[in-house]
Each structure stands twice: as structure tokens, then as C-alpha cells.
Amino acid sequence: NYANGKNNVPRLKLSYKEMLESNNVITFNGLANSSSYHTFLLDEERSRLYVGAKDHIFSFNLVNIKDFQKIVWPVSYTRRDECKWAGKDILKECANFIKVLKAYNQTHLYACGTGAFHPICTYIEVGHHPEDNIFKLQDSHFENGRGKSPYDPKLLTASLLIDGELYSGTAADFMGRDFAIFRTLGHHHPIRTEQHDSRWLNDPRFISAHLIPESDNPEDDKVYFFFRENAIDGEHSGKATHARIGQICKNDFGGHRSLVNKWTTFLKARLICSVPGPNGIDTHFDELQDVFLMNSKDPKNPIVYGVFTTSSNIFKGSAVCMYSMSDVRRVFLGPYAHRDGPNYQWVPYQGRVPYPRPGTCPSKTFGGFDSTKDLPDDVITFARSHPAMYNPVFPINNRPIMIKTDVNYQFTQIVVDRVDAEDGQYDVMFIGTDVGTVLKVVSVPKETWHDLEEVLLEEMTVFREPTTISAMELSTKQQQLYIGSTAGVAQLPLHRCDIYGKACAECCLARDPYCAWDGSSCSRYFPTAKARTRAQDIRNGDPLTHCSDGGIEGRMDHHHHHH
């Protein structure tokens, strides 16, 4: 019976109307000839939010998204016709849905779209400095987008552009069957995962990709892909989905005789996010929806936040699980999954593992191999047939930090902000849902810092109509949250301290790390501020101790609904 299992009522529940009236949301309601505002790129330096949508790319001012520039990038009528001839929907499919939007260098972005089932990429000039105010498409230089953007707008691409090379997890064919992780652009030959081998990838849906250093030597850097895929037969009875983390070495250039132009360091492991059921059978949240990496002081060890939902049609639920990279690395250094025995089931591989261990990056740190092309044949052969790890990655504390079950919505997106409060640092989660609401949740340590309690601070409706939130970015500089959906883009501040009430008690009871009672109002808390009058208690929300100045006259209803 988890504390985080309680469907705790939000301290504040704000409707779209209330959000508008209190100036707590700014919305861009989309253009008549566009939709699908799903692909976000935040540029804090230029103070811009770039958004890829249907036939358009936008550049929004982070201060106020009402101020924006746009690039129109449709497909030619001929491409549109071909797409229509292929039996596709002229409005929902036969357009250029932007799926990749990444910083390419100091002056350009790289963008790819579905191109009406004919993926296409190009460069966008944004200038050297914010004041240049440049935002234009390089229409003289289009590139084939195959292996970069999917053909089908319903599919996602997980991508990462580093050192002029694009890593992307996507579908590389018209039918949406050839899913792969690619590396394209750059000076090297494109590299991909093994084709038509369900042991490597089994109808995956890619979520995100991240570069995480392995050591102080950049040669050891790895790219991690988060995705969900069908469980391989024998791994599970019946059709099931598994959440996955996959790794590849940044300096993987494929094999020499075998796995030529294919990854030689690809490994994947299952991510578990589950709660024990009353009958001893765990309830699994397997449908990975989104991932957020919270950087720590050590760049090698960010905390991974994952949003999951259940696969079941009967039982609808969502969960947030946290993972440590040290646990991930431990699994990748553990036993490989191997099929054996009379029922050909998955078992941990017990035989001799070739040297250097498959999945290790060629570098001075872990062994004497300069390139994956120099790897011995037995390493390549083993890597080809053993892409999966036997052990799964369990979440921190072996359980979700938050679950929601008896509600009519599911989680879709997550961003996390680390906030300095009076009594320490807190991670504040902003969780997007499939009904256009955002939950603001703080993780509060109970007896120990490991045992966390979730406090649901706010539930905000950010779009006029219920719509799935498909993108979220958080600007620490602007202290704003940006949200994308099919309908448009919304912007809201990370905190609304004044809404918590007019008394110290209410401010304290709110337990919002952003807010503190300053003697006369509930306002933004700054740890650097010298004022000793600041009253705040995130850990316990105890106004009696902290509001001894007679400011307890406000209502002390912990579940106060703001209407």
C-alpha cells in the first residue's frame, strides 16, 4: 500500500478558463493550415523555442510565444499526389510533418520531415547571435530523409545530433516495418542496427536518445536510446510490450567482415516499472511514453525519469519511475540473454564471453582496440547473436515514485526541475497527460531521502479542448514551461505562488518548493535572499512551526480547490 499509490487530490486544480483569467497560460492556437506541434527544440541562448509541425517550423520567443516567426515547408503537389495515390489520407498523412529539429552548428538547425511519405531534410539558418533575427530555410539544399524521419506521421523519431552526426531511431521504409537505429550525416558511412532480426529490435517505438559519458575519456561516450517494443516470443506469455534502454558507442564504425556498417556495440535491457499486486502478481507499467534526464553534478550519472502506462485495456494506469545510470551500467555488464533448453527459453548466458566484452567501446580506457573494425570475429559473432541483456534495470527503490490509476487520463510527457528550497533540493515534476492537463508534483523525502512521497501540487488545464500533450520543454532561465499538442503550443510559468492564498498557513501547506511566505504574501522563494522572515516547509507542510507570526488565519484545508 504505497503512499504514492493514493490518488491524492491536487492542492490547486485550475481550469483553462481560470488559467487564462489569472494570466497563467499563453496559448498559440495553431494555424488553420497546420497542426501537430510535436517536435520541440529549446534554445535558451537565443531565447527561442523552435517547433516542428505540419508543413511549418516555428520560432517562438521564450518570453512570450505570441511573438513568433514561421517557415512554411510544404510538399510539392506532385509528392502530395503520389502519397494520395498510395492510398494515404491527404490531410493527415500527405503533408510534411516535421519529426527532427536539432541544432547542427552555431548558425544552423537540421530539420527533417515526413515529406508526404517521402522523408526529406534540410538546414535552417538561425544566425550567429540572437539579435541577428535570422530564421530561414535553405531551400537550395534538400537531403534524403530516409533513416532520419519516418514516412508515417503517426510514428516518432528519437534523434540526437552530435559532432555533425545524426543518431536516429525510426522506421526506414514506406510500410513502417523496417525499424532501426541509424547514424547518418558526417563523414562516415551510415551505420544501422541489424535488419530483419527481431532479437535486435522487435517493432519498436522510439522515445528519445541521449549522449551520456562513460568516463572522463570522450572515446568512451555512449548514446542511449529509450524505446518500447514487442517482447520476443518466449520472453512473455501472450503479446506484451517491454520498455527498453539501448546503448551504442559513439565511436562504433561497424565491423570489418561481419556487421559491416552495422552497430557492433548495440546492447539493450528491459526497464522495469511495476508494483506488487494483491495476488502476488506484479502490475507492470510497460508502455514507455517519455523520458527526462535530470543532470547531476557528475555528467556520467544523470537520473533518468520515465513515464509509463499500462498495456491493459481493462486497467488504465500511469507511473513515473526513476533509474540510476550506475544500475543501467551494472545490467550492461551483467549476463547476456541467451536462448537455450528444451523450450528454447531465455536464460542467462553461462559460456565464455569473448574479449573485449561486447558492448565495450574501443578506447584506451577499457582495452587495446582502437576501432570496432579491429574487433576479433568472435566478439562480432557474439554481439550479433546476443544484443539483449538477461537482467532488467529496476527503478530506484524498486518501485515507481508515483502512480495514478483511478483517473480518466494517462501520462504522456515529463520534465523535471531541480529546485532549491529552504530545507534542501527538491525535484519538481511537470507531467503532461492525454487530456491536455499538466500535473505539478514534488518528490518529498519521508523518513529517509530514499523513501519519497509524492505531493500533487497543481493540476492545470492548458488547452481549451482535451488534447494529448505530445511535447514539453522547461526553461530554467525563463522559469516557464512550454507544451505542445496537435492543437497548438501553450506557455505557463513554473510557479503561481500568489494563487496559494493570502495567509502564511496556506502558503506553507502548499508545500511548493518555488514558493515561500515573505511576511506579507506567498511569493517566489530565492535561496540567495537574505530575508529570514521566509516561511516554507516542503518536507512536512507544517504551518504551526513556521507561521508563528500570526499568519495562520487563512483556511488550513490541505485539499483546497481553487475555483
Partner: antibody, heavy 116, light 111 residues
């Protein structure tokens, strides 16, 4: 200059097979869908089949479905039409055409005669 | 029997304006772009008009296309002897999932 050159036509018995080829040049072949259109002697044009630029999708007229197979080799800039179980009514000049929302370039055609 | 209906023949004298009609249905002309093709005797067809009314480069502006509802037409003004050819209309048919042509119109330039 866009050029399409068909080959492989000829005389064939009913029930026989034939493979037509179309060599393309003067444009980025791998970027365009391609099609076959035929014209029976003294008759009008009839669309036969088309193929997506990356072979991802193929479409056929009902009259040839199950007997004809369209394919392409983008590395060789060549389009193919494998014709099996040929009938007398398949006798026609077969044109290879570049698809660009319509048939914007045509080859000179190759004659296929099916005799009974 | 062609899905798109064209008159089998048309004629005119040099300098005259001639119009060729093409009628179809909502599944082809009504909801898809119409193209016109010219086939000179003994040669391959050539694209004359695309997207209802657009001319590819190199096609004289004497040729124009238009569309209304489920019918389209090709107009040739200032008729010349070299315009003597077969003219075909074409469009994608959504219900047949295929491209359809008209039966063709044989244009004769008299005199």
C-alpha cells in the same frame, strides 16, 4: 535531359512471359515514382502499374493484377516489368513513364505482341 | 469503355480555337488533378497540362486547361497544323486506386 529507354519487348506465345526494362537518365531516379502505361494498336492509353521511389509500395491495374510485377533497381537507374501468363489482350506498346503527380516524361515504348 | 469520357474527334481550321472536353466523376476529376497529354502520330505521349491548368515549360501558351466540378477541358487557340494529334485527359481515380485516361480525342486541322 530526361531520357527513358524501354527494352525487352517482342513476340511471345499466349501464357508466356516477358521482362521489360526501362533505363533512366537525366534525373535523380531514386527520387521519383515510376510507372508503366500501355497502348494497344489503334487504341487509347491504359495505366498498368506504378512503383514508389523506394519500392515501398506497388500498384497495379485490375487487368494485370497477379500476373505482372513491377520492380526497380535504384543503383542501376532501371525500372522493370515482369509479365507472366500473357494474354492476347496484353498486346500493346508499353511505355515507361516518370511519375511526378502525373506522367511528366515518357519513353518511346517497346512493342509486346502476344500471339495465340 | 474508358472511365473518363472524351469526344472521339474534333477539328478546326488554322488560327481557330478548339475545345476538347473530358467528363468524369467525383472519384476522379471531382477530387483529383487533371492532366492532358498530346500524342503526335507515331510518337510517345507528352505532358501538355498538369494540375488542371498548369503548363510545363516548353508548352506554348496557346494550350490552356480548366476544370469545373467533374468535368475538365483543354482549349487550343491559334490552331496550327502541327497540333494535329491525339489528346488524352487523365486523372487519379480514388475509388479504383488507379490512374485513368479518357478514350482520346483525334484532333484534325483542316485545310
Amino acid at each position: 535531359e530526361v531520357q527513358l529507354l524501354e527494352s525487352g519487348g517482342g513476340l511471345v506465345q499466349t501464357g508466356g512471359s516477358l521482362r521489360l526494362s526501362c533505363a533512366a537518365s537525366g534525373f535523380t531516379f531514386s527520387d521519383y515514382a515510376m510507372s508503366w502505361v500501355r497502348q494497344a494498336p489503334g487504341k487509347g492509353l491504359e495505366w498498368v502499374s506504378w512503383i514508389y521511389y523506394d519500392s515501398g509500395s506497388k500498384y497495379y491495374a485490375d487487368s494485370v493484377k497477379g500476373r505482372f510485377t513491377i520492380s526497380r533497381d535504384n543503383s542501376k537507374n532501371t525500372l522493370y516489368l515482369q509479365m507472366n501468363s500473357l494474354r492476347a489482350e496484353d498486346t500493346a506498346v508499353y511505355y515507361c513513364a516518370k511519375l511526378n503527380g502525373d506522367f511528366d516524361y515518357w519513353g518511346q515504348g517497346t512493342l509486346v505482341t502476344v500471339s495465340s | 469503355q474508358s472511365v473518363l469520357t472524351q469526344p472521339p474527334s474534333a477539328s478546326g481550321t488554322p488560327g481557330q480555337r478548339v475545345t476538347i472536353s473530358c467528363s468524369g466523376s467525383s472519384s476522379n476529376i471531382g477530387n483529383n488533378d487533371v492532366s492532358w497529354y498530346q500524342q503526335l502520330p507515331g510518337t510517345a505521349p507528352k505532358l501538355l497540362i498538369y494540375a488542371d491548368s498548369h503548363r510545363p515549360s516548353g508548352v506554348p501558351d496557346r494550350f490552356s486547361g480548366s476544370k469545373s466540378g467533374t468535368s475538365a477541358s483543354l482549349a487550343i487557340s491559334g490552331l496550327r497544323s502541327e497540333d494535329e494529334a491525339d489528346y488524352y485527359c487523365g486523372a487519379w481515380d480514388s475509388s479504383l486506386s488507379g490512374y485513368v485516361f479518357g478514350g482520346g480525342t483525334k484532333l484534325t486541322v483542316l485545310g
